[in-house]
Interface confidence: low
C-alpha cells in the first residue's frame, strides 16, 4: 500500500470549517489522482466526497460537495465546510493513483475532526 | 506512584468552558486531597488552580480562580472557564493525597483542552 | 523459478509489422506487469512500453504511434508489434517483469527485476 | 522526458578496487532509480532498486547511494566477475530512461 500522511487532529472553526493537508509517497509522477473523504465514527464509515485532479484540473470536488480542495505536487489540501459537532469524527484521507499504471491505492490513519457548535446570538431588540 | 485517570481530549464549549473527571485509585481513604491542575504548552508547565478538599469541603477553588471543582469518592470534577483558544493545550491533573499519613502523589496523564474562539454576533443596528 | 523467454523472426523487412511474443513462467500475469526494452546493436537501453496486469498499457512517446502490447493470460504470453518498421528498429529486443518492490513506509518503487535473454531482429530487405 | 546522464562512460580497473559509477537526472526521481549490469551477449541483470536496496541473491560488495537527482553506484572490491557494464534507469513517470552505460575493464 502507498503511504499517506495526514494530520492527527483538526478543530473547525467556529463557522464548521476544518481544513487539512493529504499527502501521498507517490511511487510514480501520477497524472491522474482520486481523492476520496471517509468519515468514521462508531464503526461506521461512509464517504464524505470525492474528486479527482489531473496535471490540468489541480482544483476538485462538485459544486454541491462540502468539499474543496487543491492538488499541488503530492498534496492535497482540503477543507471540508457545513460541519455541526454531530460531524465530529475520523475523516480518512484514501488516494488512488489511477494513471498511468500501475494502480496505487493509499489510506491515511484519518484526521481526529473536532466540531464545535457555537452559540446562537441574542436577538437583537 | 498513585494512578491519576483523566480523558484524554475534551472540547471547550463555544462559551470557553471544558468539563472533565480526574480519578484517582486511592490506595486508602484519605480525609484531605489536593487537587492541581497543570497546563503543558510548547514544553512549559504552569500551574492553572489547585484546591484541597475534605470531607466536609466537597467544593473546591478559590472564588477568584478559573477552576471549580466537587469532589466525590475517588474523583474529582473539574470545570475550567473563560478559556480562549491560545489556551487550548494540555491540562494535567495532579492529585496529592495529604491527610491522612502516608502522602501519596499521582500525575494524570493530560487532557488535551481544545478552545476554539466564537465568531462575534453581528451588531444589531 | 521466475523465467522468461522472447521469440519471433530475426528479420523483419522495412515498413512490415514486427511480432515478438514473450513466454513467462513462475510468475503470475493477473499480478505483475511486463515491459519491452531493446538494445541497437553497440548501444544503449530503451525502455519501449509496458503493460500492467490489469491490462493498462504505458509506451514511450517516440514509438506510441507504432506500438501495441498484448497479453493472453490462458497461455501466459505476451505479445509486442511494432509496425512500419526500419533499419532504425534493429536491435536485441527483451522482455522484463516489472514489479513494484515494498519496503520500509510502505509504497512502491518500480524495477524491471527478471529479464528474458533477448530475440535479436534485423530489419533489411 | 527525465535525461539520465551516467558517467563516467568507460572505467579500467584491477581486481580489489573499490569503483564508483554516477548517474545524474535531469530533475528529482525521489530515489526512484534501479541499477543494472550487462555482460557481454547477455540480459541485462538488476542488482539495485529504489536507489538502496540490494536485490535478492546481489552481493553485498554492490551498495547504492544518492538523493534527489544524483545517485551513485559502488563496488567495494571488485571481483573478475565484475568486469561488465552497468546501467542506471530511472522509474519515476514514464517514459522510463536509462543512462547511457559505464563500461568496466580489467587494467
Known amino acids: 500500500a502507498m503511504h499517506v500522511a495526514q494530520p492527527a487532529v483538526v478543530l473547525a472553526s467556529s463557522r464548521g470549517i476544518a481544513s487539512f493537508v493529504c499527502e501521498y509517497a507517490s511511487p510514480g509522477k501520477a497524472t491522474e489522482v482520486r481523492v476520496t473523504v471517509l468519515r468514521q465514527a462508531d464503526s461506521q464509515v461512509t464517504e464524505v466526497c470525492a474528486a479527482t485532479f489531473t496535471e490540468k484540473n489541480t482544483v476538485g470536488f462538485l459544486d454541491d460537495s462540502i468539499c474543496t480542495g487543491t492538488s499541488s505536487g503530492n498534496q492535497v489540501n482540503l477543507t471540508i465546510q457545513g460541519l455541526r459537532a454531530m460531524d465530529t469524527g475520523l475523516y480518512i484521507c484514501k488516494v488512488e493513483l489511477m494513471y498511468p499504471p500501475p494502480y496505487y491505492l493509499g489510506i491515511g490513519n484519518g484526521t481526529q475532526i473536532y466540531v464545535i457548535d457555537p452559540e446562537p446570538c441574542p436577538d437583537s431588540d | 506512584a498513585m494512578h491519576v485517570a483523566q480523558p484524554a481530549v475534551v472540547l471547550a464549549s463555544s462559551r470557553g468552558i471544558a468539563s472533565f473527571v480526574c480519578e484517582y485509585a486511592s490506595p486508602g481513604k484519605a480525609t484531605e486531597v489536593r487537587v492541581t491542575v497543570l497546563r503543558q504548552a510548547d514544553s512549559q508547565v504552569t500551574e492553572v488552580c489547585a484546591a484541597t478538599f475534605t470531607e466536609k469541603n466537597t467544593v473546591g477553588f478559590l472564588d477568584d480562580s478559573i477552576c471549580t471543582g466537587t469532589s466525590s469518592g475517588n474523583q474529582v470534577n473539574l470545570t475550567i472557564q473563560g478559556l480562549r483558544a491560545m489556551d487550548t493545550g494540555l491540562y494535567i491533573c495532579k492529585v496529592e493525597l495529604m491527610y491522612p499519613p502516608p502522602y501519596y502523589l499521582g500525575i494524570g496523564n493530560g487532557t488535551q483542552i481544545y478552545v476554539i474562539d466564537p465568531e462575534p454576533c453581528p451588531d444589531s443596528d | 523459478q521466475v523465467q522468461l523467454q522472447e521469440s519471433g523472426p530475426g528479420l523483419v523487412k522495412p515498413s512490415e509489422t514486427l511480432s515478438l511474443t514473450c513466454t513467462v513462467s513462475?510468475?503470475?500475469?493477473?499480478?505483475?506487469?511486463l515491459s519491452w526494452i531493446r538494445q541497437p546493436p553497440g548501444k544503449g537501453l530503451e525502455w519501449i512500453g509496458y503493460?500492467?496486469?490489469?491490462?493498462?498499457?504505458n509506451f514511450h512517446p517516440s514509438l506510441k504511434s507504432r506500438v501495441t502490447i498484448s497479453k493472453d493470460t490462458s497461455k501466459n504470453q505476451f505479445s509486442l508489434k511494432l509496425s512500419s518498421v526500419t533499419a532504425a528498429d534493429t536491435a536485441v529486443y527483451y522482455c522484463?517483469?516489472?514489479?513494484?518492490?515494498?519496503?520500509?513506509?510502505?509504497?512502491?518503487?518500480?524495477?524491471?527485476?527478471?529479464w528474458g535473454q533477448g530475440t535479436s531482429v534485423t530489419v533489411s530487405s | 522526458d527525465i535525461q539520465m546522464t551516467q558517467s563516467p562512460s568507460s572505467l579500467s580497473a584491477s581486481v580489489g578496487d573499490r569503483v564508483t559509477i554516477t548517474c545524474r537526472a535531469s530533475e528529482n526521481i525521489y530515489s526512484n532509480l534501479a541499477w543494472y549490469q550487462q555482460k557481454q551477449g547477455k540480459a541485462p541483470k538488476l542488482l539495485l532498486y529504489?536507489?538502496?536496496n540490494l536485490q535478492d541473491g546481489v552481493p553485498s560488495r554492490f551498495s547504492g547511494s544518492g538523493s534527489g537527482t544524483d545517485y551513485t553506484l559502488t563496488i567495494s572490491s571488485l571481483q573478475p566477475e565484475d568486469f561488465a557494464t552497468y546501467f542506471c534507469?530511472?522509474?519515476?513517470?514514464?517514459?522510463?530512461?536509462f543512462g547511457q552505460g559505464t563500461k568496466l575493464e580489467i587494467k
Open positions: 529504489a536507489a538502496t
Open positions: 522484463a517483469k516489472t514489479e513494484g518492490h515494498y519496503y520500509g513506509s510502505n509504497y512502491g518503487y518500480y524495477a524491471l527485476d527478471y
Open positions: 513462475g510468475f503470475s500475469l493477473t499480478s505483475y506487469g
Open positions: 534507469q530511472h522509474l519515476w513517470g514514464t517514459p522510463y530512461t
Open positions: 503493460i500492467w496486469y490489469d491490462g493498462n498499457t
